[in-house]
């Protein structure tokens, strides 16, 4: 998915939180050297997703996917790609 | 780099009021079932997390946004 290319570690953490998978969350947080208080904070958010059940997780995942694939984000991604191409062209 | 709209969504989830957060979600997905769910999650996070928890979550997000993996 295109959105994951923009900031893969963010989507790793988000989907680990929303999934309710504590092991997956720990693995993702290790990649960014999260402190213990930061882990605790994320686990509190994860608790809310777990308590509210599968439908809640699916619906919030849908929101994140919709925002990430909206013109607000896709326009941004296209703009960044254009900038990268310009830099690459100039670099050559 | 993270999309500013996503960043705004996450910031409001942590630091906005329930109304502010749900209004932001409504710009992208104006379905009652989705918006009610968003408010339930927001209310839960506000009830469970202390100010210190929210500061820690924000500092973690800063690490994520500045990570080479982003």
């Amino acid at each position: 998915v295109k959105m994951a290319e923009t900031c893969p570690i963010f989507y790793d953490v988000f989907f680990a939180v929303a999934n309710g998978n504590e092991l997956l969350l720990d693995l993702s947080l290790t990649k960014v050297n999260a402190t213990e208080p930061e882990r605790t904070a994320m686990k509190k958010i994860q608790d809310c997703y777990v308590e509210n059940g599968l439908i809640s997780r699916v619906l919030d995942g849908l929101v994140m996917t919709t925002i990430s694939s909206s013109k607000d984000c896709m326009g941004e991604a296209v703009q960044n790609t254009v900038e990268d191409l310009k830099l690459n062209t100039l670099g050559r | 780099e993270i999309c500013p709209a996503v960043k705004r969504d996450v910031d409001l989830f942590l630091t906005g009021t329930p109304d502010e957060y749900v209004e932001q979600v409504a710009q992208y997905k104006a379905l009652p079932v989705v918006l009610e769910n968003a408010r339930i999650l927001k209310n839960c996070v506000d009830a469970k997390m202390t100010e210190e928890d929210k500061e820690n979550a924000l500092s973690l997000l800063d690490k994520i946004y500045t990570s080479p993996l982003c």
Partner: antibody, heavy 123, light 107 residues
């Protein structure tokens, strides 16, 4: 914070008219459905009417259809209830309430309420 | 219209008690149910929506459950501030209806 203030209540004779107002503040008024809910003295709650965030749709409880009209002025953050052909059974405290969820979420969940205004229909 | 029936109509309880109020719908309302608390002379206050979703600022001692036609509001440990009348309300249709109310009074 969300504040809703009703006005316009009073004593009126059967068959006469009354217009209630509700002034709203503390939120993006044009994003929310607004409602009137009433409560007869010593009785339970009864939803009366709703107007969608943009005024495009209005719904009423059967007992007031054709007599009551709900409207809104988004430039003045105000909703109204025009009550015609009033009956004794319309005697109640009338509350203005805001939908909990914005825009399409004009689902009738009453997230915020005013303090109410008393309407007494009596000869 | 969908009829909402609450039981009991009146409930006598003491501080610290676990209190359960039941609400039945005349037909399925899925999870589209809200609970309100009202004190004498005051406007109602939203406690729970979508059957179990706690509204902002409502204490965790309040919880809601159920779906379809049968719902419950539970107060895990009754506090002095909780003596009030409670109403359920369905919003499955665009003609929302309330239960007749349950008055929770001091035993």
């Amino acid at each position: 914070q969300v504040v809703l203030v009703e006005s316009g209540g009073g004593v009126v004779q059967p068959g006469r008219s009354l217009r209630l107002s509700c002034a709203a503040s503390g939120f993006t008024f044009s994003s929310y459905g607004m409602h009137w809910v009433r409560q007869a003295p010593g009785k339970g709650l009864e939803w009366v009417a709703v107007i969608w965030y943009d005024g495009s749709n209005k719904y009423y409880v059967d007992s007031v259809k054709g007599r009551f009209t709900i409207s809104r002025d988004n430039s003045n953050n105000t909703i109204y209830l025009q009550m015609n052909s009033l009956r004794a059974e319309d005697t109640a405290v009338y509350y203005c309430a805001r939908s909990l969820i914005p825009v399409a979420g004009t689902d009738p969940i009453f997230g915020y309420w005013g303090q109410g205004t008393l309407v007494t229909v009596s000869s | 219209d969908i009829q909402m029936t609450q039981s009991p109509s009146t409930l006598s309880a003491s501080v610290g008690d676990r209190v359960t109020i039941t609400c039945r719908a005349s037909q399925s309302v899925s999870s589209w149910l809200a609970w309100y608390q009202q004190k004498p002379g005051k406007a109602p206050k939203l406690l729970i929506f979508k059957a179990s979703g706690l509204e902002s600022g409502v204490p965790f001692r309040f919880s809601g459950s159920g779906s379809g036609t049968e719902f419950t509001l539970t107060i895990s440990s009754l506090q002095p501030d909780d003596f009030a009348t409670y109403y359920c309300q369905q919003y499955n249709t665009y003609s929302p209806t309330f239960g007749q109310g349950t008055k929770v009074e001091i035993k």
